[in-house]
Interface confidence: low
């Protein structure tokens, strides 16, 4: 889960001490014991639920288990033939929700959990066996999303129990592999502990260059795979079929970031449509230190300095659906 | 304060390809984030949506003009064209270049400002012999 | 397609007064829509987008309401420079469609 450590700045090696082999194998211990510690799964759960007074009505909930910082929150139901889905909300804690029909009222319920309301009427009203699937994106933990459905039996006014099985996606392949070298590394770090338990260690005391130390953040070792770290994409599902989940957002990720200066943590100046809509006040996405982001071709929320961008050069897909989906 | 402006021939015979270009000034269109759309307008009619491109080169079209559309880019131009090939008198109409705001395809969520905030003056195309 | 339908065709107001204009989609597009003026030999100029926020620049007399199939651009007091062709645009879905506008004439 999410730690910020503190990492204070090392002052030179005296004379005699462990000049810079020990530099290395101290700051090396530090980051690995910050990737140890942020070690952690967390789960989404869905709910989904058909309202007895409308019958095509459904209300579907979603939860984040995990103490990271949300910072985007997707939901979609499917298309027909497995071509593709439909996003139906979206909802940003500091941006605020869009929803497209036929969601009728898309909210937060709490700072980890939020709640769509479909209308029922229309052709593009759901039917009993859609899937839904919500997507989290948070920090440090990185892309998650679980899906749900009702039960083909489900009375009216009967819920789905929550199923809080995260599916694993593609852009979660490289888990296993990242958290093998992360198991390594906690390894080799008490292997290291061990090897300067009886060594004198140099002297550690606060920068007194700037006002805060440097933050050493990191992902969580089933999160930290290439992909995971782009900024997530909608998800697709198929409607009233087997749920497929192959197939990714027309688009790509997010894209307010975009808007956002260098730097900026606070959401940048325009319209007031998102005011509308009570959000929880959140923290901004991910901090400009964390260069992760550059290896995963993917534009990260703000950028820092030495930060590299590569614009996803996919462009969009055509598109006939609400965001784009065919 | 980023302006388009249209250009091509006011008038293309029957059957002939009609060919636009829209300038962007003020602004480059590989920064990414924005549609580029054309939308024409029939003498004393509505307004009809053609399609846009990506500064990549993405691109959607209308249904309705699909088999005969074709919209490129030119971003060292900073420019981007219109084809409409196979031309009749129906195709007379004002066409306009804008850029649209809808989504972010850079990093593809949708934006939270939405339409064709920007438009060019409009260049009327004549069909006729 | 979804189809927009603008209603009424023509609206006679005098300055100083209310315009309500209406527009229709043939399904649901949420609260995705957009309103554009339009004045003789002019581009159209983005009023309103997302149903109810107004573009910038756009003075407060102009306002949007409505969500779903049904929505109304409501001109609190009709000025001069007021008097145009407005048109409605869904951008919920693709392609992107118009409505076939009204004209707000002096009376």
């Known amino acids: 889960m999410r730690t910020e450590a503190q990492v204070p700045a090392l002052q030179p090696p005296e004379p005699g001490l462990e000049g810079a082999m020990g530099h290395r194998t101290l700051v090396l211990p530090w980051v690995l014991l910050t990737l140890c510690v942020t070690a952690g799964t967390p789960e989404v759960w869905v709910q989904v639920r058909m309202e007895a007074t409308e019958l095509s009505s459904f209300t579907i909930r979603c939860g984040f288990l995990g103490s990271g910082s949300i910072s985007l929150v997707t939901v979609s139901w499917g298309g027909p033939n497995g071509a593709g889905g439909t996003t139906l909300a979206v909802l940003h804690p500091e941006r605020g929700i869009r929803q497209w029909a036929p969601a009728r009222q898309a909210r937060w319920e709490t700072q980890s959990s939020i709640s769509l309301i479909l209308e029922g009427s229309g052709a593009s009203s759901p039917c009993a066996n859609t899937t839904f699937c919500c997507k989290f994106a948070s920090f440090p933990e990185g892309s998650w999303e679980a899906c749900g459905s009702l039960p083909p039996s489900s009375d009216p006014g009967l819920s789905a129990p929550p199923t809080p099985a995260p599916i694993l996606r593609a852009d979660l392949a490289g888990i296993l592999g990242v958290s093998g070298v992360l198991l390594f590394g906690c390894v080799y770090l008490l292997h290291l502990l061990r090897r300067h338990k009886h060594r004198p260690a140099p002297r550690l005391q606060p920068s007194r260059t700037s006002p805060q130390a440097p933050r050493a953040r990191a992902w969580a070792p089933s999160q930290a795979s290439q992909a995971a770290l782009h900024v997530p994409y909608a998800t697709i599902n198929t409607s009233c079929r087997p749920a497929t989940l192959d197939t990714a957002h027309p688009h790509g990720g997010p894209s307010w970031w975009a808007s956002l200066p260098t730097h900026a943590a606070h959401r940048p100046q325009g319209p007031a449509a998102w005011a509308s809509t009570p959000i929880p006040a959140r923290g901004s996405f991910v901090s400009v230190e964390n260069g992760l982001y550059a290896q995963a071709g993917e534009r990260p929320p703000h950028t820092g300095p030495g930060l590299t961008l590569f614009p996803d050069p996919r462009g969009p897909r055509a598109m006939e659906g609400p965001l784009g989906v065919r | 304060q980023v302006q388009l402006q249209e250009s091509g021939p006011g008038l293309v015979k029957p059957s002939q390809t009609l060919s636009l270009t829209c300038t962007v000034s003020g602004g480059s269109i590989s920064s990414g984030g924005y549609y580029w759309s054309w939308i024409r307008q029939h003498p004393g009619k509505g307004l009809e949506w053609i399609g846009y491109?990506?500064?990549?080169?993405?691109?959607s079209y209308n249904p309705s003009l699909k088999s005969r559309v074709t919209i490129s880019v030119d971003t060292s131009k900073n420019q981007f064209s219109l084809k409409l090939s196979s031309v009749t008198a129906a195709d007379t109409a004002v066409y306009y270049c804008?850029?649209?705001?809808?989504?972010?395809?850079?990093?593809?969520?949708?934006?939270?400002?939405?339409?064709?905030?920007?438009w060019g003056q409009g260049t009327t195309v004549t069909v006729s012999s | 397609e979804i189809v927009m339908t603008q209603s009424p065709a023509t609206l006679s107001v005098s300055p100083g007064e209310r315009a309500t204009l209406s527009c229709r989609a043939s399904?649901?597009?949420?609260?995705?829509l957009a309103w554009y003026q339009q004045k003789p030999g002019q581009a159209p100029r983005l009023l309103i987008y997302s149903e109810s926020t107004r573009a910038t620049g756009i003075p407060d007399r102009f306002s949007g309401s409505g969500s779903g199939t049904e929505f109304t651009l409501t001109i609190s007091s009709l000025q001069s420079e007021d008097f145009a062709v407005y048109y409605c645009?869904?951008?919920?879905?693709?392609?992107?469609?118009f409505g076939q506008g009204t004209k707000v004439e002096i009376k």
């Open positions: 645009q869904q951008h919920n879905n693709w392609p992107r469609t």
């Open positions: 491109i990506y500064y990549s080169g993405s691109t």
């Open positions: 399904q649901s597009v949420s609260n995705n």
């Open positions: 804008a850029r649209d705001l809808d989504y972010d395809i850079l990093t593809g969520y949708p934006r939270w400002d939405y339409g064709m905030d920007v």
